[in-house]
């Protein structure tokens, strides 16, 4: 009785269960009752990452420097090349097909998380007591200056974009 289903790592072809090709190899010829499945290794620039019956290997991804990409991990016969972005850039998608410059956090916002090759800068508003007066992809919100520790008094209140302005104490009041 011909099989209607096959075991794991097998496939059904012409009423026969044949072994799938292992990762890193492509199918050359289906099995017969007398012969095992014929598989061939993928060439140097190709890969297959699953047990398969593909007759062609997939081409390794090309990390195009013109798009700001560079190789993070070289592909093997079983894995694709992993691209990442050059310094100052990050991927536009999970598959990392192109790169864009990291976002800068505007004045009033500080860097919560510095960008990586695969993720953009995360900014956060400076809370009360902190400020940022620059547009930056690295700078966090800085705390207002503590006038008291310098034996000074606040002459101008700080904002999320400006530091407090300290000045000398009024001696006449003393």
């Amino acid at each position: 009785e011909p099989p209607t289903a096959c075991r794991e790592k097998q496939y059904l072809i012409n009423s026969q269960c044949c072994s799938l090709c292992q990762p890193g190899q492509k199918l050359v010829s289906d099995c017969t009752e007398f012969t095992e499945t014929e598989c061939l290794p993928c060439s140097e620039s190709e890969f297959l990452d699953t047990w398969n019956r593909e007759t062609r290997c997939h081409q390794h991804k090309y990390c195009d420097p013109n798009l700001g990409l560079q190789v993070q991990q070289k592909g093997t016969s079983e894995t694709d090349t992993i691209c990442t972005c050059e310094e100052g850039l990050h991927c536009t998608s999970e598959s990392c097909e192109s790169c864009v410059p990291h976002r800068s956090c505007l004045p009033g916002f500080g860097v919560k998380q510095i960008a990586t090759g695969v993720s953009d800068t995360i900014c956060e508003p400076c809370p009360v007591g902190f400020f940022s007066n620059v547009s930056s992809a690295f700078e966090k919100c800085r705390p207002w200056t503590s006038c008291e520790t310098k034996d000074l008094v606040v002459q101008q209140a700080g904002t999320n974009k400006t530091d407090v302005v300290c000045g000398p104490q009024d001696r006449q009041r003393a």
Partner: antibody, heavy 117, light 109 residues
């Protein structure tokens, strides 16, 4: 390169025995089923026997059943055909051929067996 | 057992002409597992076509196969001098036995 080379042919008297060999090279012999096919002088091709890659399954043409035995030694990359009780009608060129789902894709050059008194 | 009948027995043609060879099976060939082989005098057969219509590695595209079920055809679009030989069809699905047709000889006219 992928190659099959038969040997062991010759002239033999009716009723006697002969063993043919087929040496394989250039491919993973132990993964392939193998066939013997023969061709009588001036005639067409006649399939003789097949053996599975691990040697467990064997089939024979009715004309040789009970007289011929196909076997293999995967450690030596060699296929055999033991021919007993030979008859004049067994006179032929004997070819070994590789089994695939594409048919018999590689053939040896053949070895001549002549059964004559 | 499937019987394969090839026709014509002999085909006399000139180089450059088209050759059409027929192979008829006594019952349907499973999965179109039908092959065509070429054999020149003193040489072993060579696989030309498998699966009724797929060319084997290194076979020129002037050779083509067609058909399914019980009727199969090998066509040589323009005969080259090296194509004059005997051609066999073979069913390699319905065994045992594996069967060959009686052959068609393509000779120079």
């Amino acid at each position: 390169q992928v190659q099959l080379v038969e040997s062991g042919g010759g002239v033999v008297q009716p009723g006697r025995s002969l063993r043919l060999s087929c040496a394989a090279s250039g491919f993973t012999f132990e993964k392939y089923g193998m066939h013997w096919v023969r061709q009588a002088p001036g005639k067409g091709l006649e399939w003789v026997a097949v053996i599975s890659y691990e040697g467990e399954k064997k089939y024979y043409a009715d004309s040789v059943k009970g007289r011929f035995t196909i076997s293999r030694d995967n450690s030596k990359n060699t296929l055999y055909l033991q021919m007993n009780s030979l008859r004049a009608e067994d006179t032929a060129v004997y070819y070994c051929a590789r089994d695939t789902s594409r048919g018999h894709d590689i053939w040896g050059q053949g070895t001549m067996v002549t059964v004559s008194s | 057992e499937i019987v394969l009948t090839q026709s014509p027995g002999t085909l006399s043609l000139s180089p450059g002409e088209r050759a059409t060879l027929s192979c008829r099976a006594s019952q349907s060939v499973s999965y179109s597992y039908l092959a065509w082989y070429q054999q020149k005098p003193g040489q072993a057969p060579r696989l030309l076509i498998y699966g009724a219509s797929s060319r084997a590695n290194g076979i020129p595209d002037r050779f083509s196969g067609s058909g399914s079920g019980t009727d199969f055809t090998l066509t040589i679009s323009r005969l080259e001098p090296e194509d004059f030989a005997v051609y066999y069809c073979s069913d390699y699905a319905d065994y045992p036995p594996f069967t060959f047709g009686g052959g068609t000889k393509v000779e120079i006219k």
